[in-house]
C-alpha cells in the first residue's frame, strides 16, 4: 500500500531512505527545458523476486524544443545547483544495502532528470533523518520514521530528533556515535490524511454553467 502523506518534517533536518522497499515508485521527472518522451514511462517501480530487487522501467527525457532529440539545453542558473532528492542524496551508502531482501538501491540518475526526486513510499518503508549543515542533533529517541498501516490508514511515526543551531552536524546511521534512546517510541500525533476507504477524489460538474463562457451552440 502506498503511503499517501510524506514523512514528517523536522525543522532544520532532512531525511533519506537507505534502501527502497519493493513497490516504491519514483516519478519520471525532467529538468526545465525537457519533458518525458511520449511513449516513455511515467515512473520507475522497485520490483523483484525473493532473491533480487531492481528498478523496473526507465525514465527518459527529451528536449521540449524538438521532437526526437535529447540535445542538452543551456541550464538556467537555478538548475545549476546540485541535484537534490526528497530524501537528500548522499554519497554514503551502507554496504549491506544491496543485500537487504525486498529492497532496491538508490536508482542511478538519468539524462536530464529534474533536480528533485519524487518518491511514493510503501508501508514498511523507513527513512532516516539528519540535521542540516550548521545544526546539531539532540536525540530523544531514534532519528527515523516508519510508514505504518493502522486501522486501514497509513501514517508515519514521529522521529525523535531536535536540531539545534550549533556548528556541528550529525550523520546518517552508521556514522554517528550510538546514543541512548528511551524505550518505546511515541507515535505521531497526526495520522495519515489519506486512505482508500475514507478518501475520495471528488468528481463534480463545474458549479456554474454560464452560457457565455461554458456553453456554445452551433448556429
Amino acid at each position: 500500500e502506498l503511503c499517501d502523506d510524506d514523512p514528517p518534517e523536522i525543522p532544520h533536518a532532512t531525511f533519506k531512505a537507505m534502501a527502497y522497499k519493493e513497490g516504491t515508485m519514483l516519478n519520471c521527472e525532467c529538468k526545465r527545458g525537457f519533458r518525458r518522451i511520449k511513449s516513455g514511462s511515467l515512473y520507475m517501480l522497485c520490483t523483484g523476486n525473493s532473491s533480487h530487487s531492481s528498478w523496473d522501467n526507465q525514465c527518459q527525457c527529451t528536449s521540449s524544443a524538438t521532437r526526437n532529440t535529447t540535445k542538452q539545453v543551456t541550464p538556467q542558473p537555478e538548475e545549476q545547483k546540485e541535484r537534490k532528492t526528497t530524501e537528500m542524496q548522499s554519497p554514503m551508502q551502507p554496504v549491506d544495502q544491496a543485500s537487504l531482501p525486498g529492497h532496491c538501491r538508490e536508482p542511478p540518475p538519468w539524462e536530464n532528470e529534474a533536480t528533485e526526486r519524487i518518491y511514493h513510499f510503501v508501508v514498511g518503508q523507513m527513512v532516516y533523518y539528519q540535521c542540516v549543515q550548521g545544526y546539531r542533533a539532540l536525540h530523544r529517541g531514534p532519528a527515523e520514521s516508519v510508514c505504518k498501516m493502522t486501522h486501514g490508514k497509513t501514517r508515519w511515526t514521529q522521529p525523535q530528533l531536535i536540531c539545534t543551531g550549533e556548528m556541528e552536524t550529525s550523520q546518517f546511521p552508521g556514522e554517528e556515535k550510538p546514543q541512548a534512546s528511551p524505550e518505546g517510541r511515541p507515535e505521531s500525533e497526526t495520522s495519515c490524511l489519506v486512505t482508500t476507504t475514507d478518501f475520495q477524489i471528488q468528481t463534480e460538474m463545474a458549479a456554474t454553467m454560464e452560457t457565455s463562457i461554458f456553453t456554445t451552440e452551433y448556429q
Partner: antibody, heavy 103, light 106 residues
Framework: PGESLQISCKGS????????IGWVRQMPGKGLEWMGI????????RYSPSFQGQVTISADKSISTAYLQWSSLKASDTAMYYC?????????WGQGTTVTVSS | DIVMTQSPSSLSASVGDRVTITCRAS??????LNWYQQKPGKAPNLIYA??SLRSGVPSRFSGSGSGTDFTLTISSLQPEDFATYYC?????????FGQGTKVEIK
Amino acid sequence: PGESLQISCKGSGYKFANYWIGWVRQMPGKGLEWMGIIYPGDSDTRYSPSFQGQVTISADKSISTAYLQWSSLKASDTAMYYCARLGWGMDVWGQGTTVTVSS
Amino acid sequence: DIVMTQSPSSLSASVGDRVTITCRASQSISSYLNWYQQKPGKAPNLIYAASSLRSGVPSRFSGSGSGTDFTLTISSLQPEDFATYYCQQSYSTPWTFGQGTKVEIK
C-alpha cells in the same frame, strides 16, 4: 449537442501535483475506457488515440483540480466519467460524473 | 495500443464456488496487470495491482500470471463478490482495460 462542457476532479489529502490523474469513460451498460492522463506537476498529458482531439484534459495544481473538457458535445458523449489517481494502478477513484447529451 | 482480452464475458456461479477469470494481453506486459471490481452504480475499485493484493481486500482473491496471460481467482465466492471485474495493463500508455467479466448469481 454542440455545447461545450467542462467537468472537474478535485483531489485532497495527498500531494496532488505529484500523482498522475486519469479519466475513464463508461457508456451506459458498457465497459471502462481509458481516455487519458495528466501530471498536474507539469501538465504533461497523454491521450488514448480514441480520445485524442475529442476532449482536452487539463489541471490546476494550485487548487488540486483536474478537468475534462469538450468544445462541442455529441450525443455519443453520453456516459459516466470517472477520474482516478494513478498509483500502482488507478488506486483512488472519484464517484463519477454523469454527462447526458440530448437535444 | 495493447489489447486486453478477458474471458469469459460473463459467468454464473453460486456462493462458495471457486471462480477464475482470465485476461490475455496482445503483447508482454511483464507483471503490470491490475484488477478492478465494479458494482452497479459505483466507481471501480482496485483490488489487485501488479502482484499485490490491495490492503483491505479479502484473501480469497488472488492473482497470478506474467507476460501475456493472467488470472484472477476467487477461492470461495461470497454474496458481496457478485460484480463486474476488469483487467487493465499499466505497462504502457494508454492503460487499456479488458472488456469486463460479469459474475452473476446462479
